[in-house]
């Protein structure tokens, strides 16, 4: 079954994810043609090769072509149309570049794995969490409440329906006695008295009904602000916390549908109470009294239901998606000068009336006083159309919306004025978009507004990881959406919120956080031995003070070791098998009453690129305590050469009489090596025959490979502390024992 | 209790400028739309401008049009009207007034501002 | 823009008297209109708005009527307190809005 096919299966909520990874520049069009060809392709490839990526681009174009001819032979006009659209698009994005488009086709694809993984976790938790439960009665609860609040308007429908004929009926009545009155013949005095006294009573009536309806709409309208305070001050206020948290790689945050539908049967509700006033007012047009409780009421009414709509309509204007650069989907709100970004505004009160009727209007740092209060703060313009209205049409679950795909920032450059000179650096200066529209109609004239989540603006891509910080810090710490001088002063962070956050960057990118040990680990990096959950963290030790005595920040060297597994390590991480974090002290804790040979993955410390080394142990030399020996670490420079199972699979150590061995024998905690990474090893080239030394392309050259050798026994060393790298003294020390050119050969290990 | 505050009145010369304020309390300011109504001596009532509640429309009769600038900072509560170029014609009190429901009625007005444009 | 004319532009009633002021639109404004009562030296005051709506705390004996583009302020009596200048609204569209000339009422 196609990962397409199954993503079509999913619950709407999930669905909307997928929605969001589409936009202009990939469409989704191509994914649905397409998709059982897009799925076979080696996208990862594609997108680290430019010919290969050239390749797969003109394959695609062809494959487009083909889809065309099937259109063309089913006479399916509007699908050749849309093809030869997408065709063109694909070719004015993406012939420069090929690689762009591997890459978001490759990023698609993994999100939709990804997708796919929480639906299926999330329908697990379903059958037996807590928190779900409590999710599901709160919604419940709401239900209950806005279709109380439609009912109470249907009631009122019909009580205004009786009032009406009641009143037509007592008008009636009075013309009636008053013609007969008026008849020169006259009516017997009793007979008159009788239908005076009826009359009588049927005003009583009727000031009753109108009494009673007035009532009525009050409760309503009590009902109603009871129910919308809790749409808008709890329901929508967490959905945009944990919108927040989804953005720094939290769990998928809730669609939006189900808020949508409530929001929007309120504001019906509303509208026809506007409809239910205007009626009754007619009414009071007709027949009127002293004490009127139409007159006495009506203006009350009117004012709370349009303050009512009005508060409903304002605070339904969202930001659906945050911006987000189309190549970084994992990293929203860090935008790139001159590089695209996509953003989405959703109205909840899905009106058919307000189809077409909004025209928003994006920009950029509006009413932010840190432009005029931060020294240096930068200014910026933005390119692209401004201004885009909402509809049912472009959206693929019919919701109002407006998606901004092509927006890009310049920064203002003021002449003689140096930008770095302020109290923060770029990626901490905090920025705004701003979106602005109005409902305008007869008897309502609304200004909607709302802000994106706090981005930074980076100018080259190295400021990235810097960038992806401040957006870290701030969405894990600030609730409310705009404090954009956050970082002159940044909280501390506790290590349980830190803790889940650093959790949700490994999880977010590949199927696995970290765990508890490995959290242990790092908490004792940033706050020493004594780590504990409500340990404060200061922003400069996350980012920007070295960790320990090594030259670059925790979250640097957490960032490259992130880009490591992504790149060269994901389905070793994925399967649990890199250990990763653990300090030194552990491992040995774990490793020394293991069999020889035993050995576990581990990142480097000590290397600021990103870099995965094995340790493992073995039986000393003098019957005491076992030896550990670690390999120096493999950054992304050996790892592009050799993947790390091959290395596993053939790494050597020179042992006695120079017999090269593989010491490592058993995973941690006892998985044979072969079964934990066989199925990653490369498949053995066909050996070619021994005639045959060109090989099928005939280049004159035998296959070689590469492997890891240590050529000095590690035992020889002693402990894994005097393992590569080293700080200078160090090196000094074991070049005197081992011997300068024993020591360059050992170095060399690939 | 609603209330509205006009500040800022005074003599000036032809060509010269102004700068109305109009203070509010009592009500939710960032609701509602605003307006300035100005009234010549033993004239009528003139609109002269109104702004929506987020200032993100703006609207000015003919006669101002291109030399008024009316603007509103909502978390200070006040609106405000900047007068320049101004003629011997807009010599007249100036009211601002509150624009509320459906019915964009203005239903709570200010004690008036006077403007004198004389030489 | 939507022109207001109003009529008469002043009269002369007697405490107790029905008066009748008149609004009429240059075209259909529905029941977007709003009429004020201005005494000398003071603030306009809100009497109706939507055509026929009493304001709150307005008397009953002050009433609005009509729609679309002929519209009518009854004082069904005349009270001492209600001699003052009275204007009708237009909020249709209410950017601009537009103001009649306004009817002087005077004693009699």
């Known amino acids: 079954m196609s990962q397409w096919y199954e993503l079509q299966q999913l619950d709407s909520k999930f669905l909307e994810q997928v929605h969001q990874l589409y936009d202009d520049s990939f469409p989704m069009e191509i994914r649905q043609y397409l998709a059982q060809w897009l799925e076979k392709q080696d996208w990862e490839h594609a997108a680290n090769d430019v010919s290969f990526a050239t390749i797969r681009f003109h394959d695609l174009l062809s494959q487009l072509d083909d889809q065309y001819s099937r259109f063309s032979l089913e006479n399916n006009f509007l699908l050749q149309h849309n093809i030869r659209k997408s065709k063109r698009n694909l070719q004015d994005n993406f012939q420069e570049d090929p690689i762009q488009m591997s890459m978001i086709i490759y990023s698609c694809l993994k999100e939709e794995r990804k997708i796919l993984e929480n639906a299926q976790r999330f329908n697990q938790a379903q059958s037996g969490n807590i928190q779900s439960t409590v999710m599901l009665d709160k919604q419940k609860e709401l239900d209950s409440k806005v279709r109380n609040v439609k009912d109470k308007v249907m009631c009122i429908e019909h009580e205004i329906k009786s009032l009406e004929d009641l009143q037509d009926e007592y008008d009636f009545k009075c013309k009636t006695l008053q013609n007969r009155e008026h008849e020169t013949n006259g009516v017997a005095k009793s007979d008159q008295k009788q239908e005076q006294l009826l009359l009588k009573k049927m005003y009583l009536m009727l000031d009753n009904k109108r009494k009673e309806v007035v009532h009525k709409i009050i409760e309503l309208l009590n009902v109603t602000e009871l129910t919308q305070n809790a749409l808008i001050n709890d329901e929508l206020v967490e959905w945009k916390r944990r919108q927040q948290s989804a953005c720094i790689g939290g769990p998928p945050n809730a669609c939006l549908d189900q808020l949508q539908n409530w929001f929007t049967i309120v504001a019906e509700s509303l509208q026809q109470v506007r409809q239910q006033l205007k009626k009754l007012e007619e009414l009071e047009q007709k027949y009127t009294y002293e004490h009127d409780p139409i007159t006495k009421n009506k203006q009350v009414l009117w004012d709370r239901t349009f303050s009512l709509f009005q508060q409903l309509i304002q605070s339904s204007f969202v930001v659906e998606r945050q911006p987000c650069m189309p190549t970084h989907p994992q990293r929203p709100l860090v935008l790139k000068t001159g590089v695209q970004f996509t953003v989405k505004l959703r109205l909840l009160v899905k009106l058919q009336e307000l189809n077409y009727n909004l025209k928003v209007k994006v920009l950029f740092d509006k009413d932010v006083n840190e432009r005029n209060t931060v020294k240096g703060f930068r200014k910026f313009n933005i390119l692209g159309t401004h201004t885009k209205v909402m509809n049912m049409e472009e959206s693929t679950n019919g919701s109002l919306a407006a998606e901004f795909r092509h927006l890009q920032l310049k920064e203002q450059k003021n002449a003689g004025t140096r930008t770095n000179e302020g109290p923060l650096i770029v990626t901490e200066e905090l920025h705004s978009l701003s979106f602005e529209t109005q409902l305008c109609q007869p008897g309502l004239v609304i200004d909607l507004e709302t802000t994106s989540l706090p981005v930074v603006v980076i100018s080259n891509v190295s400021q990235l990881p810097s960038g992806w910080a401040s957006i870290l810090w701030y969405n894990m710490l600030v609730a409310e959406p705009r404090n954009l001088s956050f970082f002159l002063t940044p909280p501390c962070a506790r290590w349980a919120q830190l803790s889940e956050v650093l959790s949700w960057q490994f999880s977010s990118v590949t199927k696995r956080g970290l765990n508890v040990d490995q959290l242990n680990m790092l908490g004792e990096k940033l706050l020493g031995p004594n780590a504990s959950p409500d340990g404060l963290i200061p922003w400069t030790r996350f980012c920007k003070e070295n960790i320990n005595d090594k030259n670059f920040p925790f979250w640097l060297w957490i960032e490259s070791i992130l880009e490591l597994i992504k790149k060269h390590l994901l389905p070793l991480w994925n399967d649990g098998c890199i250990m990763g974090f653990i300090s030194k002290e552990r491992e040995r804790a774990l490793l020394k009453d293991q069999q020889p040979g035993t050995f576990l993955l581990r990142f480097s410390e000590s290397s600021r690129e990103g870099a995965i080394t094995f340790t493992w142990v073995e039986r000393s030399q003098n019957g005491g305590e076992p030896d550990f020996h670690a390999v120096e670490p493999y950054t992304k420079k050996e790892l592009s050469a050799v993947t790390f199972p091959d290395i596993i699979r053939n790494y050597k150590v020179m042992a006695a009489e120079n017999i090269p061995e593989n010491p490592l024998k058993y995973l941690y905690p006892n998985i044979d090596k072969d079964h934990a990474f066989g199925k990653y090893y490369s498949r053995p080239k066909e050996a070619p025959e021994p005639m045959e030394l060109d090989g099928p392309k005939g280049t004159g050259y035998i296959k070689t490979e590469l492997i890891s050798v240590s050529e000095v026994h590690p035992s020889r060393l002693q402990t894994t502390d005097n393992l590569l790298p080293m700080s200078p003294e160090e090196f000094d020390e074991v070049s005197r024992i081992v011997g300068s050119v024993e020591f360059d050969s050992m170095m060399n290990t690939v | 209790e609603v209330q509205l505050l006009e500040s800022g009145g005074g003599l000036v010369q032809p060509g010269g400028s102004l700068r109305l304020s109009c203070a509010a309390s009592?009500?939710?300011?960032?609701?509602?739309?605003m307006y300035w109504v100005r009234q010549a001596p033993g004239k009528g009532l003139e609109w002269v401008s109104s702004?929506?509640?987020?200032?993100?429309?703006?609207y000015y009769a003919d006669s101002v049009k291109g030399r008024f600038t009316i603007s509103r900072d909502n978390s200070k509560n006040t609106l405000y009207l900047q007068m320049n170029s101004l003629r011997a014609e807009d010599t007249a009190v100036y009211y601002c007034?509150?624009?509320?429901?459906?019915?964009?009625?203005?239903?709570?007005w200010g004690q008036g501002t006077l403007v004198t444009v004389s030489s | 823009d939507i022109q207001m004319t109003q009529s008469p532009s002043s009269l002369s009633a007697s405490v107790g008297d029905r008066v009748t002021i008149t609004c009429r639109a240059s075209?259909?404004?529905?029941?977007?209109l709003n009429w004020y009562q201005q005494k000398p030296g003071k603030a306009p005051k809100l009497l109706i708005y939507?055509?026929?709506s009493l304001q709150s705390g307005v008397p009953s004996r002050f009433s609005g009527s009509g729609s679309g583009t002929d519209f009518t302020l009854t004082i069904s009596s005349l009270q001492p307190e209600d001699f003052a200048t009275y204007y009708c609204?237009?909020?249709?569209?209410?950017?601009?809005?537009?103001f009649g000339q306004g009817t002087k009422l005077e004693i009699k």
């Open positions: 007034a509150r624009s509320w429901g459906y019915y964009h009625y203005l239903d709570y």
């Open positions: 009592g009500f939710t300011f960032s609701y509602s739309s």
């Open positions: 702004i929506s509640s987020y200032g993100h429309s703006t």
């Open positions: 075209q259909s404004i529905s029941s977007y």
């Open positions: 939507a055509a026929s």
């Open positions: 609204q237009q909020t249709w569209h209410p950017y601009p809005s537009t």
